[in-house]
């Protein structure tokens, strides 16, 4: 029995930040779970982890240097990534593991989300301001 995951096919991070919502075919509220976000076709980089236990506060962390936060809905986890670099444009996969109560459950691999990070384009200020209007 596998949990199904839905995520947007593509997101654009215009301001070097993005909200990626992982929607599950499963209610997480009465479970101990580990939701994670992975970068790359081979999911080699674990970007962010949200650990939940119905009786405790949510734990959110990254062991790979990403600036991330997480929010829990009853059938979703939203990852908020900030300070992304242009070269972190890639495909990102949501993963969910239900640790307790048994049995252990995880998800069918999702299609992933391509996050396209657009660099900040600062408009150069003119060297000489135009004539002021009366």
């Amino acid at each position: 029995n596998k949990i199904l995951v839905k995520q947007s096919p593509m997101l654009v991070a215009y301001d070097n930040a993005v909200n990626l919502s992982c929607k599950y075919s499963y209610n997480l509220f009465s479970r101990e779970f580990r939701a994670s976000l992975h970068k790359g076709l081979d999911s080699a980089v674990e970007v962010c982890v949200v650990y939940g236990n119905y009786s405790q506060q949510l734990q959110v962390y990254s062991k790979t240097g990403f600036n991330c936060d997480g929010k829990l809905g009853n059938e979703s986890v939203t990852f908020y990534l900030q300070n992304l670099y242009v070269n972190q444009t890639d495909i990102y996969f949501c993963k969910i593991e239900v640790m307790y109560p048994p049995p252990y459950l995880d998800n069918e691999k999702s299609n992933g989300t391509i996050i396209h990070v657009k660099g900040k384009h600062l408009c150069p200020s003119p060297l000489f301001p135009g004539p002021s209007k009366p």
């Epitope: 075919s25 499963y26 209610n27 509220f29 009465s30 009786s55 059938e75 109560p101 048994p102 049995p103």
Partner: antibody, heavy 121, light 107 residues
Framework: IVKLQQSGAELVKPGASVRLSCKAS????????IHWIKLRSGQGLEWIGW????????QYNAKFKGKATLTADKSSSTVYMELTGLTSEDSAVYFC??????????????WGQGTMVTVSS | DIQMTQSPASLSVSVGETVTITCRTN??????LAWYQQKQGKSPQLLIY???HLVEGVPSRFSGSGSGTQYSLKITSLQSEDFGNYYC?????????FGGGTKLEIK
Amino acid sequence: IVKLQQSGAELVKPGASVRLSCKASGYTFTEYIIHWIKLRSGQGLEWIGWFYPGSNDIQYNAKFKGKATLTADKSSSTVYMELTGLTSEDSAVYFCARRDDFSGYDALPYWGQGTMVTVSS
Amino acid sequence: DIQMTQSPASLSVSVGETVTITCRTNENIYSNLAWYQQKQGKSPQLLIYAATHLVEGVPSRFSGSGSGTQYSLKITSLQSEDFGNYYCQHFWGTPCTFGGGTKLEIK
């Protein structure tokens, strides 16, 4: 077809012990939690605890710790509940039931027929 | 531990009437609640899970509602086979306590 077959009625003396069985069939035994529930005459249902045969995980209601012990035999797909130091308060019908996970919401859709335990000298 | 307060304890009604049984908890259980029917000398039968989801094969005259700490089981146009005991049970951690039960009798 999922079936939980419980052992027959027991008449036991005060202070004695009894072992009740719940034999599962029609599904993969190690993939589901089995709950135990007590029903005393004229009273309501009381949750005793659960046992997960896949990893031998157990949860007890604090009220039944020291009274009930849950075990299983995977080879016969059977979960056991041993009750010790029996008193008249333990006279009841005991049910086993399978927990199903409905996409993250739990419930007990399959129940055994119950075992009547009578404690009397 | 979560306390389950089920009311009323007993109810005497006529065939065709509508009844509502309620279950209140002392903390939010996020709809992790089931309802069972039990007839004399029989095993309990699951009617509703996740507070509102009707089990396949259970007549549509049974319905569950509620959220947070307040939940209800409603039976419309009662049939003679509906008489018996009804229990709610939470699954928000352990112990998975049952409500005290409601005895539904024919008037």
